[in-house]
Interface confidence: medium
Amino acid sequence: MAVTACQGLGFVVSLIGIAGIIAATCMDQWSTQDLYNNPVTAVFNYQGLWRSCVRESSGFTECRGYFTLLGLPAMLQAVRALMIVGIVLGAIGLLVSIFALKCIRIGSMEDSAKANMTLTSGIMFIVSGLCAIAGVSVFANMLVTNFWMSTANMYTGMGGMVQTVQTRYTFGAALFVGWVAGGLTLIGGVMMCIACRGLAPEETNYKAVSYHASGHSVAYKPGGFKASTGFGSNTKNKKIYDGGARTEDEVQSYPSKHDYV
């Protein structure tokens, strides 16, 4: 029961996380214009991974895509790649995890197969979350670097008169969405990996053997063995192999730590 809950919760958390990663990747507010010390206040510029937008004070917004790779920071390509890899891995992970869910029966799929699929999807979610967190962090670092460079340039000009003020950009909403979404995907992946451990039918170190003696009243008590090994009165090894015909269900075996009631 606990395994199913952990697996189900991991799936839901990862689903929300991947939806967030997709949303963050598509959002335009990765960087927003810093309005401090801004001479022209009628317009507000914000930028995403794919296009740059300008919103006027009237509410009118115009966006233009980056139709060229020239003039774009090289790091932007890395961020795009990281986010796309995160989405692709997450989507595949979701697909795999649907079939791995314990509550869904598909043919005669064994628990070991489901455990392997759960682990695979969990690892995919972890990598997906890390890709998103890395992508957002690289962009944030790029923003911080640009911010301080812009601040340095802001007060330079010819003859003391500032001729050009480079626009400073600060963190946009998409960064926070990306960080949270990446974290959720990561947590979901860890939960799937934990659930995998409970699903996997581990091999026991010993095999329980039942002896069937030919006679009904004959009990097999190996006295010679007892005497030679010093087991004495068999205090620890309480199991007595008494003969008799029994059904397979009646055969007693050692309780395993993996036996679930």
Epitope: V43, V54, F60, F67, N146, T164, Y169
Partner: nanobody
Framework: EVQLVESGGGLVQPGGSLRLSCAAS????????MAWYRQAPGKGREWVSE???????DYADSVKGRFTISRDNSKNTLYLQMNSLRAEDTAVYYC????????????????WGQGTLVTVSS
């Protein structure tokens, strides 16, 4: 590199009119907004008026009803029509433009002109 050049300043009597122009030239991808600022002798720079690419305008209370801002997008030129001029309007008038010089990230800048002097005196 983008350059802003103001013109039209000069000496005018109180109650008179003057039209300032500001021409933008250089590698301009898009002028999103343009503004007029002024700096009176011994004072800080004061915002006068601004206009967006779609023609939305805004004015400082001190010039409302007397000054009119306009722009010609095809010529990348900004205008300021100043009527009913007063002695307190005496200042160096600067043009500022929020420009995205090329398609890309972190390329937008606010450019300033060198200024044109307007003197209102009898």
């Amino acid at each position: 590199e983008v350059q802003l050049v103001e013109s039209g300043g000069g000496l005018v009597q109180p109650g008179g009119s003057l039209r300032l122009s500001c021409a933008a030239s250089g590698s301009i991808y898009r002028i999103n907004a343009m503004a007029w600022y002024r700096q009176a002798p011994g004072k800080g720079r004061e915002w006068v008026s601004e206009i967006t690419s779609t023609g939305n305008t805004d004015y400082a209370d001190s010039v409302k009803g007397r000054f009119t801002i306009s722009r010609d997008n095809s010529k990348n030129t900004l205008y300021l029509q100043m009527n009913s001029l007063r002695a307190e309007d005496t200042a160096v008038y600067y043009c500022a433009a929020f420009i995205i010089p090329s398609v890309g990230m972190f390329t937008s800048r606010t450019y300033w002109g060198q200024g044109t002097l307007v003197t209102v005196s009898s």
